[in-house]
Structures are given as structure tokens and as C-alpha cells.
Amino acid sequence: QEDEDGDYEELVLALRSEEDGLAEAPEHGTTATFHRCAKDPWRLPGTYVVVLKEETHLSQSERTARRLQAQAARRGYLTKILHVFHGLLPGFLVKMSGDLLELALKLPHVDYIEEDSSVFAQSIPWNLERITPPRYRADEYQPPDGGSLVEVYLLDTSIQSDHREIEGRVMVTDFENVPEEDGTRFHRQASKCDSHGTHLAGVVSGRDAGVAKGASMRSLRVLNCQGKGTVSGTLIGLEFIRKSQLVQPVGPLVVLLPLAGGYSRVLNAACQRLARAGVVLVTAAGNFRDDACLYSPASAPEVITVGATNAQDQPVTLGTLGTNFGRCVDLFAPGEDIIGASSDCSTCFVSQSGTSQAAAHVAGIAAMMLSAEPELTLAELRQRLIHFSAKDVINEAWFPEDQRVLTPNLVAALPPSTHGAGWQLFCRTVWSAHSGPTRMATAVARCAPDEELLSCSSFSRSGKRRGERMEAQGGKLVCRAHNAFGGEGVYAIARCCLLPQANCSVHTAPPAEASMGTRVHCHQQGHVLTGCSSHWEVEDLGTHKPPVLRPRGQPNQCVGHREASIHASCCHAPGLECKVKEHGIPAPQEQVTVACEEGWTLTGCSALPGTSHVLGAYAVDNTCVVRSRDVSTTGSTSEGAVTAVAICCRSRHLAQASQELQ
């Protein structure tokens, strides 16, 4: 960070005349908001990112910045515009007193303002290196395609690009945006400055210890010699990548962000924009043994967020901390004692640990997948990464109890063949944030733009919930779960699938008057049932049990409690076929599961009956899990009987298309 006092001589004293002719008033009814890092030591007061509304042009951004300077000058404050953003997000970076925030928030076009904050390299010990030779035989790993069609951007420290392991593979761009190192006695030693970035470049594309040996890389320096950077520097780096992409479009791009800071709305927004421009972003979940949703860019939904596991597939412990976890993590990857290029010498290797190393593994796998199938979208790539991961190998006891259900039990792996997965119907489970405990609280889970929401379920640890429903929001279906009075809150769980040319709709049946329960089916020609949801207004559904097995010849039907409205997700897509699979247990049981067989993909997961002792239902890979209250707290055994209902689908169309390609 620039010396707070030292450069005030340089600050532009804006002229009052700048104000003339800039009398655009802020739009009525819209209040700009101020955000800052929740972690106090990471805050950088005095520097602010002013984010303008989406359609703001560069000229308007510049004019708004000048207007701020002019109004500040009238009040006797000096300001300095450090950067004007365009290409990714409209806005500007300004050095000013916090006293001016109120004024800045009232400027025209302003959407929100965020105080700058620190981001950090996510490796431990990233500068206490241990020189070691590679501990494997090079023959063992000869990937079919080394990622040669893909360019991987690395936003990190400086790197020793002529290290034997990566020479010729990494182009060092002229981009550099780093804060001053802390401490007056800091000694800048080149090999230490390059340590983190060199190691990660080696993990991604190193000749002997790299994942994607054919991938070419470009490095941007956003972390200083202590492994520290800023949100604003990272934003400007992401903007640089977007501009480079526009100037010289190349093949698929992967951006590796092996860094983390506190939750940042603006950093997440920039990642979203870049992802929507077709760039794959991979980031470290963070090394704080905490919920990854509290950190950025880990919490950005469009980013592939990677936690770290060790050689035994256990979550990595890093001193007193360890890998982050939770619903914002997409998958885990090796992140302990990872051998890679050491900047201590041109032939040295070192082992480093952390979610940075894990993210570098996934960036390498992504580069190989994209090189084999350059047309893959971000959604398709993410689904493939999940599909080919090792399932259920992580010991979940390491995670806090309330995070276990939310954290994906997936360890990244290379596909057995980088081609030929096209026939598969890919689905993943997306958990919402927790709703909070208020009576009317709801939680919403969303799929990515090019995924289809095929089913929606809900879960509450207390069991006090009012079900869930699929509803349209901004032209897209979302999954909304409802808390109940006295409940501690709910989660919405969306099943998000890749289903090309799909036409899906929701059919709803209101609560039934009759005692037989509520039913709804897919009545449109060619539409099949992909998921069932139920939602009720009453606080307790009671013990009414609808018939568990649906009548023969009516597989396209959702059945539920008579006091609940039932929602059927009905889809039409070429060659799509689905079937209902049920597993009922007569005696009370805390967990009932039912899985789809090989070749079929779980699209829907729900529970019968929807009574209050059922905590909820959710999909884990291809298994539908229904959780009930602790058996000891369940009154009668008759109420304890629970059925897990899975809807399993496959696409004959995708299978045929794949065979035709081969």
C-alpha cells in the first residue's frame, strides 16, 4: 500500500469548476451501499472501489470520478483516482478519506462502494522451503493430452520463469499491482519473492511434477514478497485478463487465483463477469479451517473453489488451521506436501501445502479437459470435474458437525479418458445459504445460467420447516425452502443438471381436501417427471400418511401430504427418460437412502411422508438421502416409517450423439 502521508503532495486537487454541468441526480429510490471486510486486520481504509451501475460507460465513470474529486475539494479534502475500471466492472479506485463516503454514495450511477482489503497466498509454509527431489518415477504419469490448447493465467507472486521445470511454459506479463511489504526491516530476497508463484506454476504445468505438462501459462503479479495483495490489485488483474482476451482471443482460458481475502462483493462480482465471458476461474478455498463462504473469491458461485486433502484423502491440517470447507467448496484436491519447482535454484524442488496447491491441481485438470474438449462451457467443465472425482473418500469427522452435510465429499481426479463423457447426464447438488431462524425466513438455491433445475428439496436440522417449492425468478427456476415457527432455519437444495434443449416447467397441486393426500403429475405429451417438492403453510403436518407407492402405470406422479401443495418438475428433452425408485423402511431410522443404478443419474430426491419428524432430503452424488429426527425423540414407530424417493434419469439422445462422434 502507498504510504498514507507520503504521496499526498501528488494528490490531484480537483477544481471546483469540474462540478459545473455534472448535476445528474442519483436515481430516486436507489440507495448505494457501503461494504467492508469483516476481518478487521485485513481492512485497508483510505482506498475504496466505487462500483457503478452495470450499464455505465467509461466516460460516465470518468465523469463520476471527477465529480467526486470536485465535491471533495470543495470540502477541503484531497483525493486521488488510482484506476478507472472498464471492461469487467464499471467504476474506479479512489484514495480518499473515509469522511467522504457519505458524499460518494450519493453520486450518480453509484451502485455500491467497497473499502479495499488484503488478500493472501494460500500455502503454508510458502516461504520456508525444504529442498527435495521429485519422489516418483516420471513414467508413471503420462497424460493423454497435456493441456496444450489452453492458456492458464496465474495471479500470484513474481515467478522464476526460467526454472528448469517451467522454462518456456510461462510468459511473465508486465502486469504488477502489489502493496508495499510490511515492516521497515523487510529484506526482499528474490528467491523468496518468487517462491509461491514458481511452485504453483510447476504444479500446473511443470515438466516433471506438473499436472498439465502441455499447458502454457501467463503470470500476473498481484502478491508481494510476503504473499500479500489487495482486492483492488486482484480486480485490476482480472480486468487486464479480460482486456487481453478481447484484444487477442485465444483458445480456452483458465484463471488460477491461489489467494484469499475476506468476503468481497466486488471481487465476487468481477469473477462472475469474467466467468460469464467464458473464462474458467479456479480458486483456493482458503487455509482458515472455516466456512469458505466467508472468503473471496472462494465464495463466488461462478468460481471453481478447491479445498485441500492429503495423500490419505483426509482434509489438510495446516498448523492450528487447515483447509476451508462448506457449501462454497466445489471439490477437494491434493494439497499437502506437494512437490513442485522451488525458486531456491533452477533445478530445485520443494514441497508446499495449502489450498493454493489444491487449486493448482484442479487448474491443471481443467486445462487438460479443455484441451481435449475446447468447446466445454464452465458449467460442463464443473459437472465433469465433479463426475470424475473420487466420491465419499474424505473423513467428514474433521469438519464441524454442522458443515458435514454441506461439504462435498469429492476429491478431484483426472478422467480415465479425456474424451467420451458426453453421453452422461450430469447433475450436481447446490446448497443454499442458511435461511436464518425467523418464522418467515426462506433460503434460495440457484443453478448456473446454463444448467437446468430438475428438482428442489429442503433440509432443517430441527425438522421445523415448511417444505420447498420451485419458482421462477428472473426468467429462471430457483429452489426456495421455507422455515417454520420455532425452527432454527432451513437450507434449499437444488439439483442442477446439464440437459441440452430442455423445456422444463413446474406443475402444482394445491393441498387436497380428501384424505388420500395431494397428487400431481406431468400431463404434457413427452414431458417426464424429474423431481417432486412439497410446501405447506401449517406449522406441523401431523402424521397423515399418503400411500407410499404410487399407483402402477403412473410413474409421472408426485404424491404428498393432503395439507401440502405438491410441485412436480416436468421436463421435455430429446431422449430423456426417467423412473421413480423408492426405498421405504418400516421401522424408525435416522437415515434412509436410495441410489440410482449405473447409467442413470439422480435428478430428484424427496421424502414420503412429508411429516414433521423428517428433517429433509438431499442428493449426495447419485444417492438420495432422507434424514429423520433422532429415533429416541420420535414418538410412535408408525410415524417413524420413512420412504426415500429418487427420480433417476438418463438421456438416450446424449448417448446416441456420443456414439455418432466416436
Epitope: 527431489p133 521429485p134 518415477r137 516420471a138 513414467d139 503420462q142 522464476q160 520463469s161 526460467d162 528448469r164 522454462e167 518456456g168 510461462v170 510468459m171 511473465v172 528474490a190 515438466r207 516433471d208 505438462k213 535454484c345 533452477s346 533445478t347
Partner: antibody, heavy 115, light 109 residues
Framework: QVQLVQSGAEVKKPGASLKVSCKAS????????ISWVRQAPGQGLEWMGW????????NYAQKVQGRVTMTTDTSTSTVYMEVRSLRSDDTAVYYC????????WGQGTTVTVSS | QSALTQPASVSGSPGQSITISCTGT?????????VSWYQQHPGKPPKLMIY???NRPSGVSNRFSGSKSGNTASLTISGLQAEDEADYFC?????????FGGGTKLTVL
């Protein structure tokens, strides 16, 4: 295009010193170091060492350690190799090559050490 | 004594295929993906023909191919042509340096 251009032939007396230059062009210098390789008449290739164009770090072959110094001048994109205390068995063609991968070679500098 | 062992000479007729071997240890050829092959005509600098075991630089004929098994790397030239007559050297990384083979003289009969 990528090019490495070396200095001209040299005749030296035993005990003298030799300094060969290699000027690089056509690529991003910091992405590769420079290797030095020599070839005695009718013999094979011998790797002598490597220097980083990025930070000046060196990696010398054990056989020549202490007698060889490699340096770089980034302002002129030129790398130098100095050999001290020349002996008759230092008679060889000296090549510079790009990086450890040695994908591009200089034209060679013939060095004769003779009394 | 070179660190990597190559046959001193091989020969073949035009159109034939020949293979040159390069044997090292687990500390060089067997331990790294970075085996290279160079062609050298008399009075000329070496030219890179194969890098990282089996990759061909652009501009090198696809008649040249490389492979590796254990501690031995091989260069195969198919459809021999008169201009292939030259010396061929293999090289490999070691933990801290580079080593070359002694060279193989290829004669096209």
C-alpha cells in the same frame, strides 16, 4: 525469429582466460536461461552450466566449477562465459543454447588453446 | 566416459527404419520426462529433434519419434533419407545438471 549469436573464434595460450559472448534475440529473455555446451574435436557434447537471464543465478557442472563464470548483461541481452586457467583440453567449439531444453543453439565459437 | 550410453554407430538403407537407444539410470533418464535428441551435421551446431521424450518441435519431420521405457530412451527414424546421415546425441536432466550421451553416427547406406 529466435536467434543466439556468438562471438568469433579465439586462440589462447595455456593459463590464459577466455570470454565468449552470446547475444539473444526474438524471444522473452526472462522465460529461459542460457546453457553452455562444448564439444572437443571429434568428441561428444559436454554440458558446462546454465545462467538465469531473470536473476543471474548460475548452475555449473561439477567438472568446471571454480574455473568458469557465467554472467549476463540484460541491457544488451547478452550472456558471457569466462573460462580461466585454460588448458589444452579446453580446445573445443563452445556453444550457447536456449534454456535447459536447448531448443535453439548459437553458431558456436571455436577456441584453440595452444602454446 | 559419458553418463548416457549410446551405440557408437548404426546404419540403414533409404526407406528403412532405425532405432538408436540411450541408456541411463533412474537418476537421469528413468527419473525425468526430459529426454531430448539432437542431430548434428559436420561443422554445424546441434539441432533439437525430440524433446520431453516424445515431442517434436515444429519443423521437424514426423519420421522422427521418441519413446522411453524405464531407464532407456529411444529415437526411431522411419523412412530413412540420405540427409538423415549425421551424429545423434541424447540428453537428460539429472537432479542438478544435464548429461549427454556419447553420440551415435548414423550412416545411410
Amino acid at each position: 525469429q529466435v536467434q543466439l549469436v556468438q562471438s568469433g573464434a579465439e586462440v589462447k595460450k595455456p593459463g590464459a582466460s577466455l570470454k565468449v559472448s552470446c547475444k539473444a534475440s526474438g524471444y522473452s529473455l526472462t522465460s529461459y536461461g542460457i546453457s553452455w555446451v562444448r564439444q572437443a574435436p571429434g568428441q561428444g557434447l559436454e554440458w558446462m552450466g546454465w545462467i538465469s537471464a531473470y536473476n543471474g543465478n548460475t548452475n555449473y557442472a561439477q567438472k568446471v566449477q571454480g574455473r568458469v563464470t557465467m554472467t549476463t548483461d540484460t541491457s544488451t541481452s547478452t550472456v558471457y562465459m569466462e573460462v580461466r586457467s585454460l588448458r589444452s583440453d579446453d580446445t573445443a567449439v563452445y556453444y550457447c543454447a536456449r534454456g535447459y531444453g536447448m531448443d535453439v543453439w548459437g553458431q558456436g565459437t571455436t577456441v584453440t588453446v595452444s602454446s | 566416459q559419458s553418463a548416457l550410453t549410446q551405440p557408437a554407430s548404426v546404419s540403414g538403407s533409404p526407406g528403412q527404419s532405425i532405432t538408436i537407444s540411450c541408456t541411463g539410470t533412474s537418476s537421469d533418464v528413468g527419473g525425468y520426462n526430459s529426454v531430448s535428441w539432437y542431430q548434428q551435421h559436420p561443422g554445424k551446431p546441434p539441432k533439437l529433434m525430440i524433446y520431453e521424450v516424445s515431442n517434436r518441435p515444429s519443423g521437424v519431420s514426423n519420421r522422427f519419434s521418441g519413446s522411453k521405457s524405464g531407464n532407456t530412451a529411444s529415437l526411431t527414424i522411419s523412412g530413412l533419407q540420405a540427409e538423415d546421415e549425421a551424429d545423434y546425441f541424447c540428453s537428460s536432466y539429472t537432479s542438478t545438471s544435464m548429461v549427454f550421451g556419447g553420440g551415435t553416427k548414423l550412416t545411410v547406406l
